[in-house]
């Protein structure tokens, strides 16, 4: 359920508020609907950077749970093959705040277009 993914993103934003994490993360800020699965996979990969950088058990657990929920939601859509989409490394690097903002935006796109 994508709303549960949103809920975990809210938890992560709450948890990182008091931390100083300097990492920049590959961020897709303008997702084309035909590339949303590819973009989501990039977001999930980059999320693990936050988990590692924070060194926080609560963030680690929440990230782990979010990835499981998101992968379950993606697999329920069946095996979607997308072509012509950007590789993660081609995306713009943004700070954590902007990354999470764009992450919420793409999850909302999955909800809105389901």
């Amino acid at each position: 359920n994508w709303v549960n993914v949103i809920s975990d993103l809210k938890k992560i934003e709450d948890l990182i508020q008091s931390m100083h994490i300097d990492a920049t993360l590959y961020t897709e800020s303008d997702v084309h609907p035909s590339c949303k699965v590819t973009a989501m996979k990039c977001f999930l990969l980059e999320l693990q950077v936050i988990s590692l950088e924070s060194g926080d058990a609560s963030i680690h657990d929440t990230v782990e749970n979010l990835i499981i929920l998101a992968n379950n939601s993606l697999s329920s859509n069946g095996n979607v093959t997308e072509s012509g989409c950007k590789e993660c490394e081609e995306l713009e690097e943004k700070n954590i705040k902007e990354f999470l903002q764009s992450f919420v935006h793409i999850v909302q796109m999955f909800i809105n277009t389901s």
Epitope: W2, V3, S7, K10, L100, Q108, M109
Partner: antibody
Framework: QVQLQESGPGLVKPSGTLSLTCAVS?????????WSWVRQPPGKGLEWIGE???????NYNPSLKSRVTISVDKSKNQFSLKLSSVTAADTAVYYC????????????WGQGTLVTVSS | SSELTQDPAASVALGQTVRITCQGD??????ASWYQQKPGQAPILVIY???NRPSGIPDRFSGSSSGNTASLTITGAQAEDEADYYC???????????FGGGTKLTVL
């Protein structure tokens, strides 16, 4: 600075169709944002009507869904609202608004236009 | 329920602090945003996300969230803060946007 401007008839007859257009300037309707219509009956609170994304995706308030159509015209940088089978209860100030990226918010609003349903 | 509940009215003495609340189950998953609306004017976004202020919004406005409740705090209320305040979020399906019923703030 993004600006939104609603236009359309200020008076609609009962059982008729309310039609409004929102012209977007200072920004592109083909941005990553969703675009919404919100209304406010006189002396009452705000009610979300529906939203559209420039690729044509729409979502509507379940209580209005059977009567609402929102469309987008990218060539004119505008989006439109149609509300059918109107009654006096649809009399309200109608606002168009741009949704922010990420968490729910409306970061830019039109000034609003009063639509009265009366014969 | 996907409703957002606000107290209809609140008051604050000039220069004092007031907190306006918004309750709803959906706020466990989503942050709320807050709008100020003065008579005859369109709403203005004052707080969004965890606690973000758009440019031009005074820093006396702040937002917070706990459980199923979102709060807007005005620290050192000014006469010009007298207005209606609305919260906004998504419903529990995530698909639909919803508003609270609004709180009319009077500055005494």
């Amino acid at each position: 600075q993004v600006q939104l401007q609603e236009s359309g008839p200020g008076l609609v007859k009962p059982s008729g169709t309310l039609s409004l257009t929102c012209a977007v300037s200072g920004g592109s309707i083909s941005s990553s944002n969703w675009w919404s219509w919100v209304r406010q009956p006189p002396g009452k609170g705000l009610e979300w009507i529906g939203e559209i994304y420039h690729y044509g995706y729409t979502n509507y308030n379940p209580s209005l869904k059977s009567r609402v159509t929102i469309s987008v015209d990218k060539s004119k940088n505008q989006f439109s609202l149609k509300l059918s089978s109107v009654t006096a209860a649809d009399t309200a100030v109608y606002y168009c608004a741009r949704e922010g990226i990420g968490w729910p918010s409306f970061d830019y609003w039109g000034q609003g236009t009063l639509v009265t349903v009366s014969s | 329920s996907s409703e957002l509940t606000q107290d209809p009215a609140a008051s604050v003495a000039l220069g004092q602090t007031v907190r306006i609340t918004c309750q709803g189950d959906t706020l466990r998953s989503y942050y709320a945003s807050w709008y100020q609306q003065k008579p005859g004017q369109a709403p203005i976004l004052v707080i969004y996300g965890k606690n973000n202020r758009p440019s031009g919004i005074p820093d006396r406005f702040s937002g917070s969230s706990s459980g199923n409740t979102a709060s807007l705090t005005i620290t050192g209320a000014q006469a010009e803060d007298e207005a209606d305040y609305y919260c906004n979020s998504r419903d529990e399906s995530g698909k639909n946007l919803v508003f609270g019923g609004g709180t009319k703030l009077t500055v005494l």
